[in-house]
């Protein structure tokens, strides 16, 4: 089972450049759009243009780009115009996952850290930017401060918490908050009082191959909401899973292929086999997702380099009681399905 | 008619940011079919491109590896220029910086350049 | 030290031909257009030539660029003695991925 989607052939064939020193301009105001929008195969995401216009089917992984015809988002696909330097018109959608990060528009490659100013360092895991700060100040003054500021101190990258009402801070309450100020800068903290909160992971951001689903977490030394990712993939883009439908019946809620295989990620392949479920599909208009899953760690061995872990959505089964929209639509809206968390995370 | 016109100072102490702008006239710096970038030369390593910005639909920065974790370069749409920073030069890094712009006929149009010498 | 390599220098008397040629390999040269550029003394460069054959307005005819495989050549006819200046050829690299330039050719006019 490749964990990797199956690219569709949809290249976007730009215009031949003239000779002339001018671009061809890929978007046109006002917009001009076909009457109906387009069918896209399953899988291909329903989206609106880079110009706003009108209605598209996203280009897929290697499929050429331009500021009109982007990439589909909800595969974690961006459009890398590095290979058109120095004119920057033509790109190709390159996956994420795997490849390396883009944050305020520069790439940085799978694992690098950087700082992208004094007070936080990031680094780049699969596509996803996770920051530390590095102003770990104490929480603002409470109770006794009516007006709690942050104040840039000069020569110092860190802000710090001053209070405007100090002159009317009641005497009794002096030693209240004096923890919350103890703590300089430079030194992590584990807040007490913290409360835990976990966020259900998101639904998967594709219909079908490899995406991902998020969720947010604080479970963590500083109490602090981090993102937390997972690779997903409710079903394979490749099989035509309706034929897999029992007579009589409308739906096959659960599919699973006969026999284990790897999984396979950015050219790199599962140290063991699996044999996972993946949600089916109904011919009415209904659709299928998880409702029991759990998260599982899968390592990969790269045939160049060290190896990787990756935290995978594990289905252990499915239901198909919703009335679903065009599946080329149903994430691009990023609607969340309603009422159903994952029943084990 | 594009022209450039670069602004900063000629000197910086090494260790210290060297910090160059340059105001666009005839074009505007979120053109959709432009990108802005930083080139330098000097007698050791002739012409050297340092990276540029450009829009297309957000923005996008695309360095060079061998400044890549020194370098910033930022559009100011405001004032229809952009910018360059560069962290922690050394006297390798004095140079002749120009601005320029690359669009389909690659660098088209270029500043009148910028002699920064890095000494103590 | 550049991978795109040039002739330190040329020379030609006025009225003459001269080509300047430029050497890189598969990742430069070979898959990416190339530009040259003039180098006036004390001045920025100028764009004569893009997309290895074509040419800005106003650049005079007397230019021509040309490329096969991972080389460039830029020819200049009627060489008059305000050609002398510095040449360099420019392409995209995308196996460093940067924009590289050649080592420069100083043309002089004899």
């Known amino acids: 089972t490749a964990l990797s989607p199956t690219p569709t052939t949809m290249t976007f064939t730009p215009a031949p450049l003239e000779e002339t020193t001018t671009r061809p301009e890929f978007c046109k105001w006002p917009c001009e759009c076909p009457q109906s929008p387009p069918r896209c195969p399953l899988g291909v995401s329903l989206i609106t243009d880079g110009c706003e216009c009108c209605k598209i089917c996203a280009q897929q992984l290697g499929d050429n780009c331009t500021e009109a015809a982007i990439c589909d988002p909800h595969r974690g696909l961006y459009c890398d115009y590095s290979g058109d330097r120095p004119r920057y018109a033509i790109g190709v959608c390159a996956q994420v996952v795997g490849v390396g990060c883009v944050l305020d528009g520069v790439r940085y490659t799978n694992g690098e850290s950087f700082q992208p100013n004094c007070r936080y360092n990031c680094t780049c895991i699969d596509g996803t930017v996770g920051c530390t700060p590095l102003c770990l100040s104490p929480r603002p003054p409470r109770l006794w401060c009516r007006q709690p500021r942050h104040v840039r101190v000069p020569g110092q990258c860190c802000e710090q918490w001053v209070c405007d009402d100090d002159a009317r801070r009641p005497r009794q309450t002096a030693l209240l908050d004096t923890r919350a100020f103890a703590a300089s800068g430079a030194v992590e903290q584990r807040y007490e009082n913290c409360i835990a909160y976990t966020s259900p992971w998101s639904p998967c951001s594709t219909t079908c191959g490899l995406g991902i689903s998020t969720r947010i977490s604080n479970v963590n030394a500083r109490c602090w909401p981090e993102q937390e990712s997972r690779l997903c993939n409710l079903r394979p883009c490749d099989v035509d899973i309706q034929l897999h439908i029992k007579a009589g019946k409308k739906c096959l809620a659960v599919y699973q292929p006969e026999e284990a295989t790897n999984f396979t990620l950015a050219g790199c392949v599962s140290t063991r086999t699996y044999r996972p479920k993946y949600c089916g599909v109904c011919t009415d208009n209904r659709c299928c997702i998880p409702y029991k899953s759990k998260t599982i760690s899968v390592d990969f061995q790269c045939p160049e380099g060290p190896g990787f872990s990756r935290q995978v959505l594990w289905i252990n089964a499915c239901f198909c009681n919703l009335s679903c929209r065009n599946p080329n639509d149903i994430f691009a809206d990023l609607e969340s399905y309603p009422d159903f968390e994952e029943i084990a995370n | 008619q594009v022209q450039l016109q670069q602004s900063g100072p000629g000197l910086v102490k090494p260790s210290q940011t060297l910090s160059l702008t340059c105001a666009i006239s005839g074009d505007t710096v979120s053109s959709n079919s432009a990108a802005w970038n930083w080139i330098r030369q000097s007698p050791s390593r002739g012409l050297e491109w340092l990276g540029g910005?450009?829009?297309?639909?957000?923005?996008?920065?695309d360095y060079a590896v061998s400044v890549k974790s020194r370098i910033t370069i930022n559009p100011d749409t405001s004032k229809n220029q952009f910018s360059l920073q560069l962290n922690s030069v050394t006297p390798e890094d004095t140079a002749v910086y120009y601005c320029?712009?690359?669009?389909?006929?690659?660098?088209?149009?270029w500043g009148q350049g910028t002699l920064v010498t890095v000494s103590s | 030290q550049s991978v795109v390599t040039q002739p330190p220098s040329v020379s030609a008397a006025p009225g003459q031909k001269v080509t300047i040629s430029c050497s890189g390999s598969t990742s430069n040269i070979g898959n990416n257009y190339v530009s040259w550029y003039q180098q006036l003394p004390g001045t920025a460069p100028k764009l004569l030539i893009y997309d290895n054959n074509k040419r800005p307005s106003g650049i005079p005819d007397r230019f021509s660029g040309s490329k096969s495989g991972t080389s460039a050549t830029l020819g200049i006819t009627g060489l008059q003695t305000g050609d002398e200046a510095d040449y360099y050829c420019?392409?995209?690299?995308?196996?460093?991925?940067?924009?590289?330039f050649g080592t420069g050719t100083k043309v002089t006019v004899l």
């Open positions: 320029t712009r690359s669009a389909p006929a690659a660098f088209d149009y």
């Open positions: 910005t450009y829009y297309r639909s957000k923005w996008y920065n």
């Open positions: 420019g392409t995209s690299d995308t196996s460093l991925s940067i924009y590289v």
